[in-house]
Amino acid sequence: SIPWNLERITPPRYRADEYQPPDGGSLVEVYLLDTSIQSDHREIEGRVMVTDFENVPEEDGTRFHRQASKCDSHGTHLAGVVSGRDAGVAKGASMRSLRVLNCQGKGTVSGTLIGLEFIRKSQLVQPVGPLVVLLPLAGGYSRVLNAACQRLARAGVVLVTAAGNFRDDACLYSPASAPEVITVGATNAQDQPVTLGTLGTNFGRCVDLFAPGEDIIGASSDCSTCFVSQSGTSQAAAHVAGIAAMMLSAEPELTLAELRQRLIHFSAKDVINEAWFPEDQRVLTPNLVAALPPSTHGAGWQLFCRTVWSAHSGPTRMATAVARCAPDEELLSCSSFSRSGKRRGERMEAQGGKLVCRAHNAFGGEGVYAIARCCLLPQANCSVHTAPPAEASMGTRVHCHQQGHVLTGCSSHWEVEDLGTHKPPVLRPRGQPNQCVGHREASIHASCCHAPGLECKVKEHGIPAPQEQVTVACEEGWTLTGCSALPGTSHVLGAYAVDNTCVVRSRDVSTTGSTSEGAVTAVAICCRSRHLAQASQELQ
């Protein structure tokens, strides 16, 4: 019967006793940077070309005996997971292997850098179709390795990497911490994070998504028909490389940003038990398990958005945190979050010709996060409209006044350490959805966008009694672009988007007491693109 991992990534409409997705990734070449491989294993023979690239350190220990099957174990298994004819994800994808890990699975940053350069040169000499580079390795944070990944990604190559098996923040490792790389954590058959001895999968904001990574059946280098079960984030990354190959084979013109957004969009949502992660990492770690799209075509009409968390600002009074979108993405809204609740809001600002989301810590605060909502919006023209503090009792307001511009997000930022929270919340006058409303002592920032066929609406959910969390979701066919809290409550820790749901978090109810100021309202801005939908219908 079908291995659990292949069943897990397969949408229900393709489920059968055998895994036979519609397109095997035949137009895509996957580069594997790993150990040597047993290329004559019947699972991968004829599918994997072993390049002459080899850059590995000496094995440790004088008593180490090289045994071919052990040297090839990791790479052979991963090649099988990506494109194996029996237990592979992208059965049609061709692969090229580069040896950057020795027989003990150890490599060097320099060896990996030279390997990436080898791929870049190969791409220049003989341009082929879409390229996916699988980096099933993790080492300490390396600015130079991250930069090399960025260069290759900007040349149009899709890089997929393992989050690492250290039960730690993936941002502390490379290439997992490189924003341009698709970083993959590992889950098991129960959709739980993978435990590996005393350690396990890495987690945190640098992980893009999770994928099957425990008891993964694949080619064993022991013999030509041998199979073995292996576990780890390398196996998880191999699944995503295979899914990426299939998506790119179906839509070869997809950019890295489009591919990443699709991987996120088609993932299984909220299936991972977050209790496994350290408490401070739960909100930062995506609750996503990779899956193939239900159809390889026709996703183009959707407005895709993802949430990008910044690094923690640190606790100093003037500390700020910045969240950035990828080059091909539009920043449609900006929010902030602080566990202590002490923050001075957030704002969108231009940096290097592109909008970024900046959050501000407050005196006595333990630090803040900036949260960017990054979307794919072709032909978009977005700008930020700001209203300074109003000082009037009605609060601060700003709206999108340009013709054809719609409101996609609201941010508020204040200089005072503590807003006058004794005032009741300001309510938005009905029939004026195209404006942001904020506290009178705050400056308000409206993200206003013009794009063909773009329409947005505001959706609110208010709870009169204090609650630790208030949510409001966009309905089917609409995409969450903006998430904020209505002003006037002291205990709001911040707001952030989780998939298509806006989450407003408050302080522990027991500490705030149940006063009239306890009301919390979550405000979602939901958008869709009629233009993209029409374009899609014309193509079909």
């Epitope: 019947r42 699972e43 064993s220 022991d222 028909t225």
Partner: antibody, heavy 119, light 113 residues
């Protein structure tokens, strides 16, 4: 039920070409390997080679490489063994058999095709 | 290539008696990654195709009578018919399926004494 059905016996002259077939049914044909096994009169079993119908990947026993061609048409769940120029020494019973990655032994065999090459 | 050698070439056993066939491979077919022996046993009766009896050296195929058993590991294997029946008259082959080319033993002919 799961079965492999082979084409009928053939009598040929040396130098002639021949293509025999093996049709699978009752299972997902593209997800199993099909091997061909020769048994010369009164002799043992010799593995000739195999094909994976899913992508037409083939692997041959070096003793048979260049002597025969293994192919498949997955649209009709059929594998083939062919000779471009038969020799008298090709006289034998030919069996097809299937195997799977999780069970890499021959669990189902065809009934056999007797090929007689004589002038 | 892995060479498979069976002994004896032929064997005559009385009905109800035990029949033992040995098979030796020129290199080990036991693999550490899954601790399995990549060895199978087949039975071929006159005018019929071979039939799978035992795989992974000791696992009986469904529908095969329990008088048939396989044992051994690494390079030395045994097929045992605990109580020979008239319908067991056949040629028995061992086969390694770990590396290509796949190879069979030369066969052992079992007859009734």
């Amino acid at each position: 039920q799961v079965q492999l059905v082979q084409s009928g016996a053939e009598v040929k002259k040396p130098g002639e070409s021949l293509k025999i077939s093996c049709k699978g049914s009752g299972y997902s044909f593209t997800n199993y390997y099909i091997s061909w096994v020769r048994q010369m009169p009164g002799k043992g079993l010799e593995w000739m080679g195999m094909i994976y119908p899913g992508d037409s990947y083939t692997s041959y026993n070096p003793n048979f490489q260049g002597q025969v061609t293994i192919s498949a048409d997955k649209s009709i769940s059929t594998a083939y063994l062919q000779w471009s120029s038969l020799k008298a020494s090709d006289t034998a019973m030919y069996y097809c058999a299937r195997d799977h990655w999780s069970k890499p032994f021959f669990d189902i065999w065809g009934q056999g095709t007797l090929v007689t090459v004589s002038s | 290539d892995i060479v498979m050698t069976q002994s004896p070439d032929s064997l005559a056993v009385s009905l109800g008696e035990r029949a033992t066939i040995n098979c030796r491979s020129s290199q080990s077919v036991l693999y550490s990654s899954n601790n399995k022996n990549y060895l199978a046993w087949y039975q071929q009766k006159p005018g019929q195709p071979p039939k799978l009896l035992i795989y992974w050296a000791s696992t009986r195929e469904s529908g095969v009578p329990d008088r048939f058993s396989g044992s051994g590991s690494g390079t030395d294997f045994t097929l045992t018919i605990s109580s020979l029946q008239a319908e067991d008259v056949a040629v028995y082959y061992c086969q390694q399926y770990s590396s290509f080319p796949i190879t069979f033993g030369q066969g052992t002919k079992v007859e009734i004494k």
